[in-house]
């Protein structure tokens, strides 16, 4: 008998090369075969459970950046007046959540912020839990 | 044929709203359906393997905080003279280990320390390994 | 019917007690039953996917340390002029990658650097993906 295989784990790596002041960061998924999807600059959560979240990036100017997942809830990450980020976190997310950026710059210029090495990774930690597709 | 499902991963999120000087933090599990259990203010480890550990909290006064798992072993986390914690770690834990806090304050007052956003998450990373229930 | 078991997750914990200036750290795997292998002071990657990486150590002198995975790619970790490291990261690694150290000291002495608590952990986060053995 063939040993059971793991169904694919819900995970995604998105990249971002620019962020818009008072808005968010433009995220793209470089791989076609990710198990999670991007929609309207947000990562769509289909499965309940803990997620490992990794956020990296180097910004062309000082900014304040937050990563949200649900209206009315506090951010997953919140960084104030930084030019880079390299953070890891764990959070419980659920079906219908959407992970998205909010960015504010402190310059009078309202130009886009350029980003090098901008990367956001989400990896589901509770396969076997509830999922809705 | 139905594809195999994942058995539930051993994981738990506990909350703590106060810590006792020279003792530990009072932990409660908000969810009934956690796959790990709390006993005597300790999280009980039933499965051998690596665990992802996330610890967060904001304290009402400066304290030193350690998170232990086994008598005679060094702490999983150790923070000296802090008013907040937001740390992630990986550690190998085994059946019979118990994860618990030790706290020391620097004030002459021996009052309890209040905690906002106190959260400890453990997520097993090696399903398929040895477990004893 | 017996519920399906998880096949073992690709993971490894290696230890290192010394590092050689201008070279790397001498890594050994204390456990015989690791699911990943060490070869020529490198950890061999057989499975594509995200990896959770934990790096810890206390060094007998100040050094700069990088952890690489592929020629011509930037490091997974890079620390400058430190006497200790306690870092966690997430990275996408693939079949044929090799994870290894590079170390530089700032002393005129070219002696080995002693390490206490030197530990590198890799845990695959995408079981079910491509593996080559």
């Amino acid at each position: 008998q063939v040993p059971p295989q793991y169904p694919p784990i819900q995970s995604i790596r998105v990249q971002f090369t620019r962020c818009e002041n008072e808005k968010g960061c433009i995220i793209t998924s470089p791989s076609k075969d990710e198990t999670m999807k991007v929609q309207d600059n947000s990562i769509i959560i289909n499965c309940d459970g803990f997620y490992l979240i990794s956020l990296k990036g180097y910004f062309s100017e000082e900014l304040s950046l937050s990563l949200y997942y649900r209206k009315g809830r506090g951010p997953l990450f919140s960084l104030s007046k930084v030019t880079s980020v390299d953070s890891i976190g764990v959070a419980y997310l659920a079906f219908k959540d959407k992970v998205y950026f909010n960015v504010t710059t402190h310059s009078t210029s309202y130009k886009d912020i350029q980003v090098n090495g901008g990367e956001l990774i989400l990896i589901h930690q509770n396969p076997g839990g509830f999922c809705a597709y | 044929q139905v594809p195999p499902q994942y058995p539930p991963i051993q994981s738990i999120r506990v909350q703590f709203t106060r810590c006792e000087n020279e003792k530990g933090c009072i932990i409660t599990s908000p969810s009934k359906d956690e796959t790990m259990k709390v006993q005597d203010n300790s999280i009980i480890i039933n499965c051998d393997g690596f665990y992802l550990i996330s610890l967060k909290g904001y304290f009402s006064e400066e304290l030193s905080l350690s998170l232990y798992y086994r008598k005679g072993r060094g702490p999983l986390f150790s923070l000296s003279k802090v008013t907040s914690v937001d740390s992630i770690g990986v550690a190998y834990l085994a059946f019979k280990d118990k994860v618990y806090f030790n706290v020391t304050t620097h004030s002459t007052s021996y009052k309890d320390i209040q905690v906002n956003g106190g959260e400890l998450i453990l997520i097993h990373q090696n399903p398929g390994g040895f477990c004893a229930y | 019917q017996v519920p399906p078991q998880y096949p073992p997750i690709q993971s490894i914990r290696v230890q290192f007690t010394r590092c050689e200036n201008e070279k790397g750290c001498i890594i050994t795997s204390p456990s015989k039953d690791e699911t990943m292998k060490v070869q020529d002071n490198s950890i061999i990657i057989n499975c594509d996917g995200f990896y959770l990486i934990s790096l810890k150590g206390y060094f007998s002198e100040e050094l700069s340390l990088s952890l690489y995975y592929r020629k011509g790619r930037g490091p997974l970790f890079s620390l400058s002029k430190v006497t200790s490291v306690d870092s966690i990261g997430v990275a996408y690694l693939a079949f044929k990658d090799k994870v290894y150290f590079n170390v530089t000291t700032h002393s005129t002495s070219y002696k080995d650097i002693q390490v206490n608590g030197g530990e590198l952990i890799l845990i695959h986060q995408n079981p079910g993906g491509f593996c080559a053995y």
């Epitope: - | 350690s66 072993r73 060094g74 702490p75 999983l76 986390f77 150790s78 000296s80 003279k81 | 007690t17 010394r18 810890k56 206390y58 007998s60 002198e61 100040e62 006497t83 200790s84 306690d86 002393s107 002495s109 002696k111 080995d112 002693q114 390490v115 206490n116 608590g117």
Partner: antibody
């Protein structure tokens, strides 16, 4: 000025237990590796145990492994050595020692020592 | 485990050079530290990293290390240098001391 003061030494019976303390001042305790070193009467120095600044890494000489535990309370600027299952050969003066930063874990400052006597 | 070998005792004439040796397998690849301990006192670090002197240690103390031998040299021994001298290295996460050399200044 750096000071290290050991205490807790005593006369104890074989298989007994004892906890030594070392209170330090004059430096930021949590930034430094600490060690215990012992010296049996009329004999040389023997390293006993190492602990990192944050207390997360500990190592021991083979002779005391699983019997002794080194720990520290950075809030109290205090280093500890919990000794159990004591043997007559553990009789010695016990010194705590602070590392010299980034100098190969050389022992820059020592306390005056505390005497532990194990005898029936 | 790693072993450091020192001669138990050594005599030196006042104001003459004294050489105290510490032997170990390929000790030249390790960093050696030296301590002086006078009767009834705690040890004092006198040389670290083979040849570096901490602040306050007289210039007459120097160190060298190569091959299988590390050497502590006192260029002109004084009466106050009469003491026990210990070498120390780290190996495989453990510290090792030599057995010590008692220096008598004649």
């Amino acid at each position: 000025e750096v000071h290290l003061v050991e205490s807790g030494g005593d006369l104890v019976k074989p298989e007994g237990s004892l906890r030594l303390s070392c209170v330090v001042s004059g430096f930021t305790f949590s930034n430094y590796v600490m060690n215990w070193v012992r010296q049996a009467p009329g004999k040389g120095l023997q390293w006993v145990a190492f602990i990192s600044g944050d207390g997360r890494s500990t190592t021991y000489t083979d002779a005391v492994k699983s019997r002794f535990t080194i720990s520290r309370d950075n809030a109290k600027n205090t280093l500890y050595l919990q000794m159990s299952s004591l043997r007559t050969e553990d009789t010695a003066i016990y010194f705590c020692a602070k590392e010299k930063y980034s100098s190969g874990w050389s022992f820059e400052y020592w306390g005056q020592g505390t005497l532990v006597t194990v005898s029936s | 485990s790693y072993v450091l070998t020192q001669l138990p005792s050594k005599n030196v004439t006042l104001k003459q050079p004294a050489h105290i040796t510490c032997g170990g397998d390929n000790i030249g690849s390790k960093s050696v530290h030296w301590y002086q301990q006078k009767l009834g006192q705690a040890p004092v670090l006198i040389i670290y990293y083979d040849s570096s002197r901490p602040t306050g240690i007289p210039e007459r103390f120097s160190g060298a290390n190569s091959g299988n031998t590390a050497t502590l040299t006192i260029s002109g021994a004084l009466a106050e240098d009469e003491a026990d001298y210990y070498c120390q290295v780290w190996d495989s996460s453990a510290s090792v001391f030599g057995g010590g050399t008692h220096l008598t200044v004649l």
